[in-house]
Each structure stands twice: as C-alpha cells, then as structure tokens.
C-alpha cells in the first residue's frame, strides 16, 4: 500500500479510538428492537444480553438510563451524540467506512440471527445519511467470525 | 479499569533474543492498536513500532527492521515484542502502550543485556 | 522522521507559578481533513511509566488536572503548567503520531525552584 495511505490509517484509528461510537449502537440496537416490537416479538428475551458499563468499560455511557430503552425515549438522544461522533470522519470517506465497520463489529454476538444482522447493517448503512452525511460508497460490513474476540 | 500488565525482568546475552509480552484487560482488545517504546537508563524514550490487534497489520521504526516482530494472540487479549540479536545497547525498560495515541501504559519490563 | 525538538531541556519553577514548556515539529502535524494535530504530551516520574496528559495537542486525558493545558497548530506547540505544584515535578515528553516513525522529544525535566 501507498505510504500516504498507511499514514492516514493510522491518524484513522486514532480517530476511532477517540470516538464514542456507543451511541450509535444504542440507536441502532433500539432502531431495530422497536422495528420488531411492532411485529410482536419481545427484544428483551434473555437471550439479549445488552451492555452493561461492566461489560464495556472502555465506553464510558453516561447516557442511557437503561440498556437500549424499548420505549424509544432517549434514541434522538443516541441519534444526535452519534451524528456528533460520525461528523468526525465527514471528510475522511475510509474512515468514515473503519467506524461502521467498527460498529458492526461491536454489535455482532448480540444479533439474533441472520435477519436481525441483515436489518442491523441496513439501518447502519443508512446510519451517515440520517446524520446528513455522505455515506462511504464501498464499505464492507460484513464480520469475520475472528473479529468477534470480546473483553 | 484498563490495565496493561507486562512480563517480568529479563537477563539475556549479547546475540540472544527476547520476548516480552503485555496482557490487555477492561477493555475491547481488537479495538486498540498497541505501540511499543523503549527507555535506556536516563534516557528519554523511543519508539519501536506499532501492532494492530484486530488485522496483526505492524509499523517498525527504521532502527529495529529485521530484528524486531510485534504478534498477538487474541484469545488471550495479549500483544507480544521479540527483539532478537541483542546487544547491550539494548538494555532498556520496554513499555506496550494502548492506542495510537499511547493513552494507557504496562508497567515496563526491565531488559538486561550482558554478557 | 518528524523530528520533535523540546525546549528547555530543564526548567526550574517555584510553586504556584507557571511552566512552559515549547515543542517544536520538523513538519507540520496538522491534519487538514479533520483540523487535528496529531500531537500528545507525557508526563514521567522517575521509576514509573509516562502519563498521558493531553492528546490532539490541546485535549486534556479525564482525570488530567485542568491547570495542564496544550495549545498550539501546525509546527509549534506549547504545554502549560499553571499554579505548579510538587506533585508535577517530573519529566515531560511531547510525542507526535501523525506519521510513522511516531518520534517523542528528547525531554523536559521540570524541577522546583
């Protein structure tokens, strides 16, 4: 690779290390819960297993009163902290892609099944859009099964 | 908390290799390059390379191409240094760091090199 | 290489008053697309590892005390000590990591007066 292009890279992670990319998730998370709601299934089986500050810590959350509140109270809340986060990387379109795909990731063992992952990639693809941003035009979102390793 | 936690001091001999490794907690591994910098006696510091957790993708500072490689295994939440052909201009306090931006630091890991 | 050059190599300040301590770029480590300057400061006590005390040359680290401040664009940077206290007595490195090599300055020990 381009030696300008690893040297962006690395000011990219930077980047991603610095953001708070946990709203985002919360939004999405409640997005897609309340999308099911309303074709009756319960998102809270206890299967679920949503954050918890203990599960992640190196997220602080001071936000969420409780993990992906299903009333939806506090998801505009989500949205504008995680268009404030994804404003970030407006002017870095691979960057732009790293933090979706960073996301995606995060998410990934708490997705019921292969439609909840189908419908959590859809609403994140149109995550930068929503926020009034241009959307990465080639981001992969798909997760290797080794990008799963969680502390 | 996030905690970095090092092996322990090292005794080895001129041309002998080294390998140091720094086990990551409270946080999500894969999420956080590792950097690893060194500091002689008195000295100030300097940086080797960097590792990324999530790819194995490695940067090496010009000084130590060739004779340093920087691994992890992610089952554990480990991130491992080898040095090899030591001299005693490589003794030093070798240090892993989380994040490009070296936010949190292992506790150091003594190096010694003498014959 | 960036070459980062620190100055002064020591200072000596009395408690209370303020410390300066100038880091100069060999190139600019300013990031036009998102306006960061990829530039950090540590702070060393003898036998412990360094502390990261500011990042993107003026964001403090939580739990940084606000009297560490860093300011400063493109090739010249500047970390503030104000009100000193013992306590800050230590060694202090700037580090930029907006290109590899990542290269620190070669330090400032900063002392009571």
């Known amino acids: 690779r381009q030696q300008w292009e690893l040297q962006g890279d690395r000011r990219c992670q930077s980047q991603l290390e610095r953001a708070n990319l946990r709203p985002c998730e919360q939004h999405l998370m409640q997005k897609i819960q309340r999308d099911e709601d309303s074709y009756g299934r319960d998102p809270y089986s206890p299967s679920q297993d949503p954050y918890s500050p203990s599960q992640d810590p190196d997220r602080r959350d001071p936000y969420s009163p409780s993990p992906y509140d299903r009333r939806g109270a506090g998801s505009s809340q989500h949205q504008e902290r995680c268009c404030n986060e994804l404003n970030e990387f407006e002017n870095n379109q691979r960057c732009m892609c790293e933090a979706l795909q960073q996301i995606m990731e995060n998410q990934s063992d708490r997705l019921q099944g292969r439609q909840q992952e189908q419908q959590f990639k859809r609403e994140l693809r149109n995550l930068p859009q929503q926020c009034g941003l241009r959307a990465p035009q080639r981001c992969d979102l798909e997760v290797e099964s080794g990008g799963r390793d969680r502390y | 908390q996030v905690q970095l936690v090092q092996s322990g001091a090292e005794v080895k001999k001129p041309g002998a290799s080294v390998k140091v490794s720094c086990r990551a907690s409270?946080?999500?591994?894969?999420?956080?390059?590792i950097n690893w910098v060194r500091q002689a006696t008195g000295q100030g510091l300097e940086w080797m390379g960097w590792?990324?957790?999530?790819?194995?993708?490695?940067g090496y500072a010009q000084k130590f191409q060739g004779r340093v490689t920087m691994t992890r295994d992610t089952s554990i939440n480990t991130a491992y240094m080898e040095l090899s052909s030591l001299t005693s201009e490589d003794s030093a306090v070798y240090y892993c760091?989380?994040?490009?931006?070296?936010?949190?630091w292992g506790q150091g890991t003594r190096v010694t090199v003498s014959s | 290489d960036i070459v980062m050059t620190q100055s002064p190599d020591s200072l000596g300040v009395s408690l209370g008053e303020r410390a300066t301590i100038s880091c100069k770029s060999s190139?600019?480590?300013?990031?036009?697309?998102?306006?960061?300057?990829?530039i950090a400061w540590f702070q060393q006590k003898p036998g412990q590892p360094p502390k990261l005390l500011i990042y993107?040359?003026?964001a403090r680290e939580s739990g940084v005390p606000d009297r560490f401040s860093g300011s400063g664009s493109g090739t010249e940077f500047t970390l503030t000590i104000n009100s000193l206290q013992a306590e800050d007595v230590a060694v202090y490195y700037c580090?930029?990591?907006?290109?590899?090599?990542?290269?620190f300055g070669q330090g400032t020990k900063l002392d009571l007066r």
């Open positions: 760091a989380r994040g490009v931006d070296g936010t949190n």
């Open positions: 409270g946080y999500i591994f894969r999420n956080f390059d």
């Open positions: 590792m990324s957790p999530k790819s194995g993708d490695t």
């Open positions: 190139q600019s480590i300013l990031d036009n697309s998102n306006n960061k300057n990829f």
């Open positions: 993107w040359a003026s």
């Open positions: 580090y930029q990591y907006y290109s590899t090599p990542h290269t």
